[in-house]
């Protein structure tokens, strides 16, 4: 069988072995080494030796397989924007940001550059779950029966109505969407002023 | 600017090993995009290239030398050094090491040491 | 290897006159991987033409390279006092790097 070609070696087709750790150099006709993420090109290749990788400064990543001449300089999370880090820019990632809690991507090139603040559910309805916290406004669905949320918020979650015979009571008046079950002493028959609330 | 300088000895029996440094002055060894060379000149004979060296120890021989040659690399003192084993008559020359020049001249040499004569003898 | 074979050995000229130095390559080596050399008794090599045909720094524009594939030129329009040395090829093409067994330009 052929021996394997080691870079820097001649191609003719413009195309390189193993595309991911090689690339073409178009002005000697040769594939050569990409450098590792981590690191950056420190020497390009000719047609004698190979390309020389070196380290990313502190501060610095590149984070694919590359040919750059440089390392990308970390950002950090913008807090006006509304991010915020979850985990630290390394040599080979950079920085990983997150919309703050309470807020969702507005604005979105590659990564997320702007959050906003998540639209308020009003009374009888929360907002569905998603996959990914952040990833877009509130989409408030009401609640399902036997529930209830009873204030305009983009976080609270609907409730399950009170069992008013968990309490060793009786309902008085059942819950909606928007609002519990009203419960009452057994004993005590409602006063018609007192209707809709709860009687201890 | 950058300079070259070859030091070391000018008489090495035969069998032993020849070991030569080079300080480059001017500039720092770990410049980006430069290799550092060796090449050698027999008495009224043409250049022979020994090989070259990158600040990180990247090497590259010449493979008719490659099991005699060692090139190595002191950043901290902004040197870098030949050593050439097991040397006969036939290893007399004038040493010199020079500078890749790198960019859109690629490997050939844009800097030079004056030179330093090694003579092997008995 | 690449052998490099210069010609002619030695060429006598006067201050004034004009030098043609071949340099052939014994196989292609294309035309951005030969330079030229100058070298003076006692002295390292200076480097002229890189890439076949362009100056290296500081260069004067009497010296000129052409060629590609495996004939190469180096040609000096005037020769002055100075320009009278060896002058050497070399090829960056392939390794080892090579170079050619020199021309020398002497007063006639």
């Known amino acids: 069988s052929q021996p394997q070609a080691v870079p820097p070696y001649a191609s003719e087709n413009q195309t390189c072995r193993d595309q991911e750790k090689e690339y073409y150099e178009p002005q000697h006709r040769i594939c050569c080494s990409r450098c590792p993420p981590g690191t950056y090109v420190s020497a390009k290749c000719s047609r004698i030796r190979d390309t020389v990788c070196a380290t990313c400064a502190e501060n610095s990543y590149n984070e694919h397989w590359n040919y750059l001449t440089i390392c990308q300089l970390c950002r950090p999370c913008d807090p006006v924007m509304g991010l915020e880090e979850i985990a630290p820019c390394t040599s080979k990632r950079k920085t990983q940001c997150r919309c703050q809690p309470g807020m969702f991507c507005a604005a979105w090139a590659l990564e997320c550059t702007h959050c906003e603040l998540l639209s308020d559910c009003p009374p009888g309805t929360e907002a569905e779950l998603k996959d990914e916290v952040g990833k877009g406004n509130n989409h408030c669905v009401p609640c399902k029966a036997g529930h209830f949320q009873n204030t305009s918020s983009p976080s609270a979650r609907c409730q399950p109505h009170t069992r008013c015979e968990n309490q060793g009571l009786v309902e008085a008046a059942p819950g909606t969407a928007q609002s519990d079950t009203t419960c009452k002493n057994p004993l005590e028959p409602l006063p018609p002023e007192m209707s809709g609330t709860m009687l201890m | 600017q950058v300079q070259l300088q070859e030091s070391g000895p000018g008489l090495v029996k035969p069998s032993q090993t020849l070991s030569l440094t080079c300080t480059v002055s001017?500039?720092?060894?770990?410049?980006?995009?430069?290799?550092w060379s060796w090449i050698r000149q027999h008495p009224g004979k043409g250049l022979e290239w020994l090989g070259f060296i990158y600040y990180s120890g990247t090497t590259y021989y010449n493979p008719s030398l490659k099991s005699r040659v060692t090139i190595s690399v002191d950043t901290s003192k902004n040197q870098f050094s030949l050593k050439l084993t097991s040397v006969t008559v036939a290893d007399t020359a004038v040493y010199y090491c020079?500078?890749?020049?790198?960019?859109?001249?690629?490997?050939?040499?844009?800097?030079w040491g004056q030179g330093t004569m090694v003579t092997v003898s008995s | 290897d690449i052998v490099l074979t210069q010609s002619p050995g030695t060429l006598s000229l006067s201050p004034g006159e004009g030098a043609t130095l071949s340099c052939r390559a014994s196989q292609n080596i294309s035309n951005t991987y030969l330079a030229w050399y100058q070298q003076k008794p006692g002295q390292a090599p200076r480097l002229l033409i890189y890439g076949a045909s362009s100056r290296a720094t500081g260069i004067p524009d009497r010296f000129s390279g052409s060629g590609s594939g495996t004939d190469f030129t180096l040609t000096i329009s005037r020769l002055e006092p100075e320009d009278f040395a060896v002058y050497d090829c070399?090829?960056?093409?392939?390794?080892?790097?090579?170079f050619g067994g020199g021309t020398r330009v002497e007063i006639k």
């Open positions: 020079a500078r890749v020049c790198g960019g859109d001249c690629y490997d050939a040499f844009d800097i």
């Open positions: 001017g500039g720092s060894i770990r410049s980006d995009g430069y290799f």
């Open positions: 070399q090829q960056y093409f392939s390794s080892p790097i090579t």
